[in-house]
């Protein structure tokens, strides 16, 4: 089972450049759009243009780009115009996952850290930017401060918490908050009082191959909401899973292929086999997702380099009681399905 | 008619940011079919491109590896220029910086350049 | 030290031909257009030539660029003695991925 989607052939064939020193301009105001929008195969995401216009089917992984015809988002696909330097018109959608990060528009490659100013360092895991700060100040003054500021101190990258009402801070309450100020800068903290909160992971951001689903977490030394990712993939883009439908019946809620295989990620392949479920599909208009899953760690061995872990959505089964929209639509809206968390995370 | 016109100072102490702008006239710096970038030369390593910005639909920065974790370069749409920073030069890094712009006929149009010498 | 390599220098008397040629390999040269550029003394460069054959307005005819495989050549006819200046050829690299330039050719006019 490749964990990797199956690219569709949809290249976007730009215009031949003239000779002339001018671009061809890929978007046109006002917009001009076909009457109906387009069918896209399953899988291909329903989206609106880079110009706003009108209605598209996203280009897929290697499929050429331009500021009109982007990439589909909800595969974690961006459009890398590095290979058109120095004119920057033509790109190709390159996956994420795997490849390396883009944050305020520069790439940085799978694992690098950087700082992208004094007070936080990031680094780049699969596509996803996770920051530390590095102003770990104490929480603002409470109770006794009516007006709690942050104040840039000069020569110092860190802000710090001053209070405007100090002159009317009641005497009794002096030693209240004096923890919350103890703590300089430079030194992590584990807040007490913290409360835990976990966020259900998101639904998967594709219909079908490899995406991902998020969720947010604080479970963590500083109490602090981090993102937390997972690779997903409710079903394979490749099989035509309706034929897999029992007579009589409308739906096959659960599919699973006969026999284990790897999984396979950015050219790199599962140290063991699996044999996972993946949600089916109904011919009415209904659709299928998880409702029991759990998260599982899968390592990969790269045939160049060290190896990787990756935290995978594990289905252990499915239901198909919703009335679903065009599946080329149903994430691009990023609607969340309603009422159903994952029943084990 | 594009022209450039670069602004900063000629000197910086090494260790210290060297910090160059340059105001666009005839074009505007979120053109959709432009990108802005930083080139330098000097007698050791002739012409050297340092990276540029450009829009297309957000923005996008695309360095060079061998400044890549020194370098910033930022559009100011405001004032229809952009910018360059560069962290922690050394006297390798004095140079002749120009601005320029690359669009389909690659660098088209270029500043009148910028002699920064890095000494103590 | 550049991978795109040039002739330190040329020379030609006025009225003459001269080509300047430029050497890189598969990742430069070979898959990416190339530009040259003039180098006036004390001045920025100028764009004569893009997309290895074509040419800005106003650049005079007397230019021509040309490329096969991972080389460039830029020819200049009627060489008059305000050609002398510095040449360099420019392409995209995308196996460093940067924009590289050649080592420069100083043309002089004899």
């Known amino acids: 089972t490749a964990l990797s989607p199956t690219p569709t052939t949809m290249t976007f064939t730009p215009a031949p450049l003239e000779e002339t020193t001018t671009r061809p301009e890929f978007c046109k105001w006002p917009c001009e759009c076909p009457q109906s929008p387009p069918r896209c195969p399953l899988g291909v995401s329903l989206i609106t243009d880079g110009c706003e216009c009108c209605k598209i089917c996203a280009q897929q992984l290697g499929d050429n780009c331009t500021e009109a015809a982007i990439c589909d988002p909800h595969r974690g696909l961006y459009c890398d115009y590095s290979g058109d330097r120095p004119r920057y018109a033509i790109g190709v959608c390159a996956q994420v996952v795997g490849v390396g990060c883009v944050l305020d528009g520069v790439r940085y490659t799978n694992g690098e850290s950087f700082q992208p100013n004094c007070r936080y360092n990031c680094t780049c895991i699969d596509g996803t930017v996770g920051c530390t700060p590095l102003c770990l100040s104490p929480r603002p003054p409470r109770l006794w401060c009516r007006q709690p500021r942050h104040v840039r101190v000069p020569g110092q990258c860190c802000e710090q918490w001053v209070c405007d009402d100090d002159a009317r801070r009641p005497r009794q309450t002096a030693l209240l908050d004096t923890r919350a100020f103890a703590a300089s800068g430079a030194v992590e903290q584990r807040y007490e009082n913290c409360i835990a909160y976990t966020s259900p992971w998101s639904p998967c951001s594709t219909t079908c191959g490899l995406g991902i689903s998020t969720r947010i977490s604080n479970v963590n030394a500083r109490c602090w909401p981090e993102q937390e990712s997972r690779l997903c993939n409710l079903r394979p883009c490749d099989v035509d899973i309706q034929l897999h439908i029992k007579a009589g019946k409308k739906c096959l809620a659960v599919y699973q292929p006969e026999e284990a295989t790897n999984f396979t990620l950015a050219g790199c392949v599962s140290t063991r086999t699996y044999r996972p479920k993946y949600c089916g599909v109904c011919t009415d208009n209904r659709c299928c997702i998880p409702y029991k899953s759990k998260t599982i760690s899968v390592d990969f061995q790269c045939p160049e380099g060290p190896g990787f872990s990756r935290q995978v959505l594990w289905i252990n089964a499915c239901f198909c009681n919703l009335s679903c929209r065009n599946p080329n639509d149903i994430f691009a809206d990023l609607e969340s399905y309603p009422d159903f968390e994952e029943i084990a995370n | 008619q594009v022209q450039l016109q670069q602004s900063g100072p000629g000197l910086v102490k090494p260790s210290q940011t060297l910090s160059l702008t340059c105001a666009i006239s005839?074009?505007?710096?979120?053109?959709?079919?432009?990108?802005w970038n930083w080139i330098r030369q000097s007698p050791s390593r002739g012409l050297e491109w340092l990276g540029g910005?450009?829009?297309?639909?957000?923005?996008?920065?695309d360095y060079a590896v061998s400044v890549k974790s020194r370098i910033t370069i930022n559009p100011d749409t405001s004032k229809n220029q952009f910018s360059l920073q560069l962290n922690s030069v050394t006297p390798e890094d004095t140079a002749v910086y120009y601005c320029?712009?690359?669009?389909?006929?690659?660098?088209?149009?270029w500043g009148q350049g910028t002699l920064v010498t890095v000494s103590s | 030290q550049s991978v795109v390599t040039q002739p330190p220098s040329v020379s030609a008397a006025p009225g003459q031909k001269v080509t300047i040629s430029c050497s890189g390999s598969?990742?430069?040269?070979?898959?990416?257009?190339v530009s040259w550029y003039q180098q006036l003394p004390g001045t920025a460069p100028k764009l004569l030539i893009y997309?290895?054959?074509k040419r800005p307005s106003g650049i005079p005819d007397r230019f021509s660029g040309s490329k096969s495989g991972t080389s460039a050549t830029l020819g200049i006819t009627g060489l008059q003695t305000g050609d002398e200046a510095d040449y360099y050829c420019?392409?995209?690299?995308?196996?460093?991925?940067?924009?590289?330039f050649g080592t420069g050719t100083k043309v002089t006019v004899l």
């Open positions: 320029t712009r690359s669009a389909p006929a690659a660098f088209d149009y």
């Open positions: 005839g074009d505007t710096v979120s053109s959709n079919s432009a990108a």
């Open positions: 910005t450009y829009y297309r639909s957000k923005w996008y920065n």
């Open positions: 598969t990742s430069n040269i070979g898959n990416n257009y």
């Open positions: 997309d290895n054959n």
């Open positions: 420019g392409t995209s690299d995308t196996s460093l991925s940067i924009y590289v």
